[in-house]
Structure formats: C-alpha cells, structure tokens
C-alpha cells in the first residue's frame, strides 16, 4: 500500500512545483528577444516564426515577405543578407564554428529581382567572412585567409591579397588573439560609408609560438590543433591596416596606413577602426603595455591616393592608475562635422564619462558626470545623444537609456527608459535605425524580458515586438527562488551582492551557501537581469542560497575599484569574496559548515584561490576551465592587467599567483576540477598542471575532463557537466538525491 | 586568346589632340578583372604609363598627364580610347594599349604599339 | 612618386652566361614589382610579377627575387634570344612607375 499525501484544495502553494534540473537543460525557461534588423530610417527586416523574412514599414504598417521559406529551405539556410540596394540577399548555410565569433560557410546569392540563385562565378567554399558593401551591391569576402571583391554578385572576384596563409598570414580577419581579446568579432574589415574604400587588417603571425593540443575524434590516431597563441611575455602578431579603392581595385597595391610614431617605437596592436566619411578614417592603437592608447584620424590624399595621418590629429588616452579604458579602449562616436567625435573615458574623479572632443583630448568638454558610469554610446544624430548608463537610483547592475540634446543649450537630458516597466525592466539595451528615426528597447530584466519599438523623436512605444507570454504563463506554476540585490560596505570598499534564496526562504533557518564567482577585471555579475539557469534550480529545489558578489577589480563603479587588481590578479579579488562570505555569516541563515564556491574560466581561477585560501570557510568547491597560472593565458589580456612576466617587470606576481604554488592548501577542501581537452582559449594545460601540483602535494581531488570540448563546454556534455556538479554539491551540502 | 590592336593617326599637328582606338579581341573589355590602360615610349627611351580604364568606367590618370588626358571605354564595340589634348613634340612615342591585370599580375596583354609623331 | 633605379644600364654578356639585373625603389614598394623585356621593335613582355613569379610560358632560366627596395632579375644561362631591354615597374604605390631599363648586350 503506498500512501499519498492528500493535496489541499486549491492551494497555490500545492500547484506549484519547484524548478527541476532537467527545466534548466532542456531550456524550457528560456526567453526571446527582438533586435529589428534595421535597412532604413523606418524599416526593418524579421525572420518570422516559420522562416520567411519579412521586411516591416513602421510608417505604413505594411509587411510583405521578401524571401519565403521555401527559398531559405533550398539551401538550408540559416541566416541572410539583404544587399543595401536590395537587390539581392545572400544565404549563409553549412555553418562551422571555429572560435568565440569565428565560422565559416557556403553562401549562395540570390536575386530578388528575378527570384533566382545567382549562376555563374559562384562563390568558393567555405568562405570565413561575406559582407555586402553599405551601398549598392559589392561583396567583399575572405576565403582561405585572403580577400576578394565582386563588383556585382556575379562578376568574377578580383583578389585583393595574395599572400594569406593558414596560420601565418591573416588578411581581413582576426588571428586567435585578435578575435578573443581585441577586436571581439569574426571580422577585420571595414567599408567607408559609401562604399567607396575597403580598410583591412593584415595579422602576421609568422613568429608566434604555437599552442598544439589532441583533438581525439574517432580516428585510430587523434588530430593535433594547431593555432598561434601568444602567452603572456611571447612574440606578439604583427598587424599592419590597408586600404582598397573598390571603384579601381587591385590597381596600384593596398595603402598602408601609417601608425603614429609614438605607438610604433615599441610593439603595439590595433584596436579598432572606424570610418568617419569615404576620404576619413579614424584608427586607434594601443602600447603592448596597455595604458597608452592612440586614437589617429587619417585622411585620403587624392594626388598620391595615399593615407595621411597628422600628428595633429592624434589623440592619445593615457591611464596613470591601471590600463587605458575598461575591458577595451573605447570606440569614438563622430559627430556631423566629421572631425569631432564623443568618447567614453575617465574622468578626472575615476568614473567613465562621456567626453566631446573638438580639438584636443585636453580640452575635452564632459558631458556626463558623477559617481557611477557612462556604459556606451549608441548612436548621435543632430540633435541627440543616445548612451547607457547605471546612474538610476545608484544601482550599479542596472542599465537604462537616455537621451542628451545636444542641439540646444544647455543640453538637457531625459532618462527614456527609467519609468517605462520600473519594477519588469531595469536593465536595457537599444537599436537604432538610420538617424534614430525609430528604435527598439530590450529588456532584459528582471522581470521577464521584453522587446519593445519607439518613436526616436518622441519616444512613444509604438509597439512591443515580444514579451514572452509562453514563458510567463509557462512560469505561472513554477516555484521560482527570490532575488535581492544589496551592498555590503567594508573598509571603504562596496560590494554589491545578489542572492538568490529558495522559494520559502525564512531568515530563522540555516542554509547551504554557494558562491558563483567570475571576478574577472571590467566584469560585472551582479547585474539586474532576468535568469532561470542552473542556481535558480539550485535554490528552488535543493534549497541553496547562492550569492554572486562583484569585488575589486569588476566594473562599472568607477576607476578605484576597477584598477585596484592592476598588476596583482588574484589577491583582492579572492579577498572580496572571503569578506563577503564572512559578512553572509554575520546574516545569521547561512550554515557556515556547508559553504561552497565555484566558477568557470577566470571564476575558476578565483574559487581555487578562495578554496585554496587556507581560511577553512569553504567546505567545497568547484572549479571549470580555470585559468592556474597566468604565464598560460593570452597576451593581449593578461598583460593588459599584469603587465610582462620579466623580472624587471612583474614576474614576481606571476609566480605568487599561481594555483599550482598553492596546491597544500587544498589538503582542508573538497575540490572538483573540471575542464575540455579542446580549449583553446584556457587551456587543458591549466588543469594538467594543477592536478599534477596536487598529485605531487599527495593531495586527494575530483576531476572530470571532457574530451574534444572548448572552453564552453557545450552540447551533451552541459548536460552531463551540471549534473556531476549537482551531484558534488548535494554530496558535499549532505543533501539527499 | 586575347589580343590589343592599336589604331589611329600616325601624325598629329602641335596643339591638337592625339585620339587612339583599342579594339580587344578574344575576350570581353567588360571582365570586372581587368583593367584597360595605355603605356608610351618616347623614341630611344623608357617606359611611360599614362593611365586607364576599369569596365564600369572608372579612369585612373598618370598625374604628370592628369590635365590632358581622357581614357573611355565602348563596352559595345569592345573598345577603349585615348585622348591626349594640346600635344607637343614631347609626346611623340610609340603607344601601346595593355591588358593590365592589377598589381599583383601586372600588364600581361601588350598591344604591338603604333607610332604617334607630333609634328606640324 | 616613387623612382625605381636600374643597374647596370649596359650589361655586356655571352649567351650561356648568367645576368644579373638589378632594381632598387626610392621607398619600400613590398613584393609589388614586375620585370619586362622587350625586344627592338617589338612591345614589352610580361616576364615577372609580384617579385618573384614567372608569367604564364616564360622559361625557368628566368627568376625574381628581392622584396621592399631592393630587387633582383637573373637570367640562370643567357639564350640567345634574351638580348633585348629589361624594365621593372613598381605598383605599390601612385602612380605605377618604370625604371630606366637595362640592356643586355651580345659581348
């Protein structure tokens, strides 16, 4: 006879249910958003539900299919490209990831006009990168590491470079290190407004030391990868930026831009480039010791069809406390005169601003101040700045939108977003179409996320675009974990904190505590957005309060706390994280026997270092992908916070803040330690040499490696990676399965 | 395979204007991969580029001629032209009219060249 | 604009003997350079491109070599029919320009 509970009739409470681990796998609380994809002042294209792409007028309230599904289908298409004449779209499909932002695959063009695939100089497969031009209908493409350009779909290609090699020479996208840590796209290309030039970055990785790892697959003998990668303190890609005139192609070679003397006399990267009008470019450089950064506007010298860059027209960024900018140099937003432009960078009090500069970066007029952070600029039309930033209410994890009036004096600003949803949507973000005529918000929480279209004059919502009802009502009876965002102040330092506790949460018991941590310079965790993922499940059904804390070195609170981690990576940040532990004990329903930590990638360097702390706060913990020593990370990041692992420089520190010196003090603490043999970002190595430092210290610890996985740890073995960590945690809480 | 042929008169007076035809033969002056372009060679001398022509009809001028020169294509009769006004003893040369490939491949088509004397 | 200098002028050899032409740039024209012969009365020939690559049917006696300033024609056995005038022309930079030439002479 088995006995079953009676349910109460009615009761709220009985017909809801916790959240399950399998909710959080199968993505049955995901949301959607909508980002129009904009192709004119009023217009926008959407891939519909079943796959036709619909090309919307805000202003007549028609819609009509450009391009059916059917089409798509023929090619297995995943993805499009209106030409900006519209005269034909190109479709992407066999897609292959290479790395964060990088894959390549087959394009087909297809003519709008005639309703047939474009025969005849087809392109070659795959291809790396395809862009139209932003005017008419070129193509510029990347295929096997060289550029070509088709003046019309169907015309041969000219080519451009020559001299692309796998691995060696890259011309118009990144190298490894450029894509990850620098440009943070697939591509580096850019046409001028018109269409008129094509600038290139050309990455020589000749020189560079190559980090080579088994990919096993189901061959009898594994693959080796092999790909360029600067570590910290390695011969770094040379980059040299060309420009193409792409009405008379290929006839005298690319022009090289020259780089400003300053930034030339040592080595340097190239940070961005931006075109400010057809016979205008504005690039920015960076000093390899990142706290230099040189912002040079070029301009085309028609007699020689040369590039020339005055001394008088660089700008040079310095920081005097850590590196130039946030996670990168920010990128200049010009304004109508084509020569003055708005800038994110410091203040005089340590917080980032927006800046207009019209003649020198001295005499920088501010336009936003106080103590929090302008976080970017979206767009600057005659009489209006767009920009986000976390002023409101003095909530650093928030994101809202406002408006400043440049066009009248004093300009006056306007918070768009502020008041719209204030208790759904408090952090946002926006797209623009053609000078700001409409644009669209989307809200990403914390409340459930919603998509919304505006008057860019105005401002009025003209309508929501998407507002997850399936996922509100799927939501109904879930027993979903409470959030609340706090600080906590110590020492003069605030630590902003969100907790999250499970659904019945009363103040008088006692939980487990787990702490999820990233901790990375110009992070930010502790951000008000929506989220039902894995330690949402955590708290509604095994009864964790989980706290994500932004420390020292995180972003957004200004330059003190931001730069105080400059050249000492892996102090204050563990430090933060203990103080706000202690603190979370302090509150009186935390079992301080049953503390865990855990993180992935940077957050899986600072749980080792919380666990290895030797402060016997943590029971347990949990550490993905982690990075153990900073000798075996990227150049272009780890220098940027620690400057050269040389002894006249900071070697020192990169030897004190290794995992691996600190291998005893993992003797106290239940350690799992997690990572796919094909990262190629942190790499196996990291783990290889913190297993063989525990091993060698007699030190017992789990482990668990996936074969052939990158450092996202994705597909199947997500599935199987959250439910070995369930199992660890529960294990380590005495939680019973 | 292709073939440049030159054509025009052989003696043009100080002051006028020197016209020359390229008629292209075994391909298309409309191939988005070539350019079109003339080079002279004064008497007992070197090698000069004058200037040239893309399909779309975008020209390209050697600046120390700039002033006087027009290069147009006829897509139609699978020609392109030169003229350089307000001649003068010194641009008497051999003019050959090329297929220029860009600046990777170079002009690998040459015309045989025609004989142009400025003299009155 | 740039000035692309040849040297010898005058290269005096026998047939069977190896030459030697040379080009230098007034600035760094990268591999952007070509070679050409031509023969009296006759249009020049494409004999290189991008400093180093033989054009379609030229003879393996022919090779490129040199890049940014300073680059280098040879002739590995001279045939007869190799007596004639050599150009190199530059286009890495506006506008294209040619050197001199060098003759190669019977001796």
């Known amino acids: 006879i088995v006995l079953r509970p009676s349910r109460v009739h009615n009761s709220e409470e009985n017909t809801m249910r916790a959240l399950t681990l399998k909710d959080i796998l199968n993505g049955t609380f995901s949301y959607k958003t909508f980002f129009p994809n904009w192709i004119s002042g009023q217009e926008y294209l959407h891939q519909s539900a079943d796959n036709n792409i619909v090309l919307y007028n805000i202003e007549t309230g028609q819609s009509y299919t450009i391009l059916s599904n059917r089409t798509m289908k023929s090619v297995n298409a995943s993805n499009y490209g209106l030409s900006p004449d519209r005269q034909f779209v190109y479709l992407e499909s066999d897609y292959s990831k290479l790395w964060r932002y990088s894959y390549t695959a087959t394009y087909y063009i297809y003519d709008l006009s005639n309703g047939e695939f474009v025969r005849g100089n087809e392109l070659p497969r795959p291809i790396q990168y395809l862009c139209w031009s932003p005017v008419g209908s070129k193509l510029a493409y990347v295929y096997q590491n060289n550029i070509y350009l088709k003046q019309r779909p169907g015309d041969p290609p000219f080519q451009i470079t020559f001299n692309g090699r796998e691995n060696k020479i890259f011309n118009g996208i990144p190298d490894w290190v450029y894509e990850e840590e620098m440009l943070a796209t697939k591509y580096a290309l850019w046409w001028s407004p018109n269409g008129k030039f094509l600038a290139y970055a050309e990455f020589n990785d000749t020189d560079i030391p190559v980090i080579a790892y088994s990919y096993y697959g189901d061959e009898q003998y594994p693959r080796t990868i092999n790909i360029p990668y600067p570590k910290a303190g390695a011969k770094n890609p040379v980059v040299r930026i060309f420009i193409i005139d792409t009405t008379y192609p290929a006839y005298v070679g690319p022009q090289e831009v020259p780089v400003p003397a300053m930034i030339a006399s040592s080595d340097y990267y190239f940070s961005w480039l931006t075109w400010v009008t057809d016979e205008r470019v504005c690039l920015q450089w960076l000093k390899r010791v990142q706290n230099v950064s040189v912002l040079s506007i070029c301009d085309f010298r028609e007699d020689w069809q040369t590039w020339d860059c005055p001394k008088t027209q660089e700008h040079i960024e310095e920081s005097r406390t850590g590196w130039a900018g946030g996670f990168f140099v920010s990128t200049p937003v010009f304004s109508y005169d084509a020569i003055s432009y708005y800038k994110i960078f410091s203040d005089k009090d340590g917080y980032k601003h927006i800046h207009y500069i019209k003649d020198t970066v001295e005499n920088a007029i501010q336009i936003t101040s106080g103590k929090w952070e302008a976080i970017n600029i979206f767009r600057v039309t005659q009489d209006s700045l767009f920009y986000s930033s976390n002023e409101f209410e003095e909530y650093p994890g928030r994101r809202n939108i406002y408006r400043i009036s440049i066009g009248s004096y004093p300009p006056s600003k306007k918070c768009v977003t502020c008041h719209l949803r204030k208790e759904r949507c408090q952090y946002y973000t926006a797209s623009f179409s053609d000078y700001a005529k409409y644009y669209a918000l989307v809200c990403y929480g914390p409340g459930i996320p919603i998509s919304t279209l505006h008057d860019g004059r105005t401002d009025q919502e003209i309508k929501i675009l998407e507002e997850n009802k399936e996922l509100e009502n799927a939501l109904k009876n879930i027993q979903l974990p409470k959030e609340e965002i706090k600080k906590l102040e110590v020492d003069e330092i605030t630590l902003w904190y969100k907790m999250i506790l499970p659904p019945q949460f009363d103040r008088s018991k006692k939980y487990p505590l787990l702490i999820q941590v990233y901790g990375g310079p110009c992070s930010q965790s502790v951000r008000s957005v929506f989220a039902v993922n894995w330690i949402s499940y955590l708290a509604s059904k095994e009864g964790m309060v989980i706290a994500l804390v932004d420390g020292r070195g995180t972003a957004f609170q200004g330059d003190k706390l931001l730069y105080a981690v400059y050249r000492k990576l892996g102090v204050y940040e563990v430090e933060d994280q203990i103080t706000a532990v202690r603190k979370f004990i302090e509150m009186g329903f935390i079992d301080e026997k049953r503390i865990a930590i855990w993180g992935w990638s940077y957050g899986g360097y600072v749980s080792s270092l919380a666990l290895a702390s030797g402060t016997g706060l943590f029971k347990c913990g949990i550490a993905v992908a982690p990075v153990s020593s900073w000798e075996y990370y990227a150049s272009v990041y780890t220098e940027r916070f620690m400057g050269l692992p040389t002894k006249d420089d900071n070697l020192e520190h990169y030897k004190n803040s290794t995992v691996m010196a600190r291998a005893e003090y993992f003797r106290n603490v239940d350690y799992l330690l997690i990572h796919g043999t094909a990262d190629d970002n942190v790499h196996f190595q990291n783990s290889a040499q913190i297993a063989k430092a525990l091993v060698n210290a007699q030190v017992d610890f789990q482990a668990m490696w996936y074969s052939d996985q990158n450092h996202g740890l994705s597909g199947l073995s997500t599935n199987h990676l959250y439910t070995h960590m369930t199992h660890f945690l529960k294990q380590c809480f005495s939680l019973s399965d | 395979q292709l073939q440049l042929q030159e054509s025009g008169p052989g003696l043009v007076k100080p002051s006028e204007t020197l016209s020359l035809t390229c008629t292209v033969s075994g391909g298309s002056i409309s191939s988005s991969s070539s350019y079109w372009g003339w080079i002279r060679q004064p008497p007992g001398k070197g090698l000069e580029w004058i200037g040239s022509i893309y399909y779309s009809g975008s020209t390209n001028y050697n600046p120390s001629l700039k002033s006087r020169v027009t290069i147009s294509v006829d897509t139609s009769k699978n020609q392109f032209s030169l003229k350089l006004r307000s001649v003068t003893a010194a641009d008497t040369a051999v003019y050959y009219c090329?297929?220029?490939?860009?600046?990777?491949?170079?002009?690998?088509?040459w015309g045989q060249g025609t004989t142009v004397t400025v003299s009155s | 604009e740039i000035v692309l200098t040849q040297s010898p002028a005058t290269l005096s050899l026998s047939p069977g003997e190896r030459a030697t032409l040379s080009c230098r740039a007034s600035?760094?024209?990268?591999?952007?350079l070509a070679w050409y012969q031509q023969k009296p009365g006759q249009a020049p020939r494409l004999l290189i491109y991008d400093a180093s690559n033989r054009a379609t049917g030229i003879p393996a006696r022919f090779s490129g070599s040199g890049s940014g300033t300073d680059f280098t024609l040879t002739i590995s056995s001279l045939e007869p029919e190799d007596f004639a005038v050599y150009y190199c022309?530059?286009?890495?930079?506006?506008?294209?320009?040619f050197g001199q030439g060098t003759k190669v002479e019977i001796k």
């Open positions: 600035q760094s024209v990268s591999s952007y």
């Open positions: 022309q530059q286009r890495s930079n506006w506008p294209p320009t």
């Open positions: 090329v297929r220029d490939k860009g600046y990777y491949y170079g002009m690998d088509v």
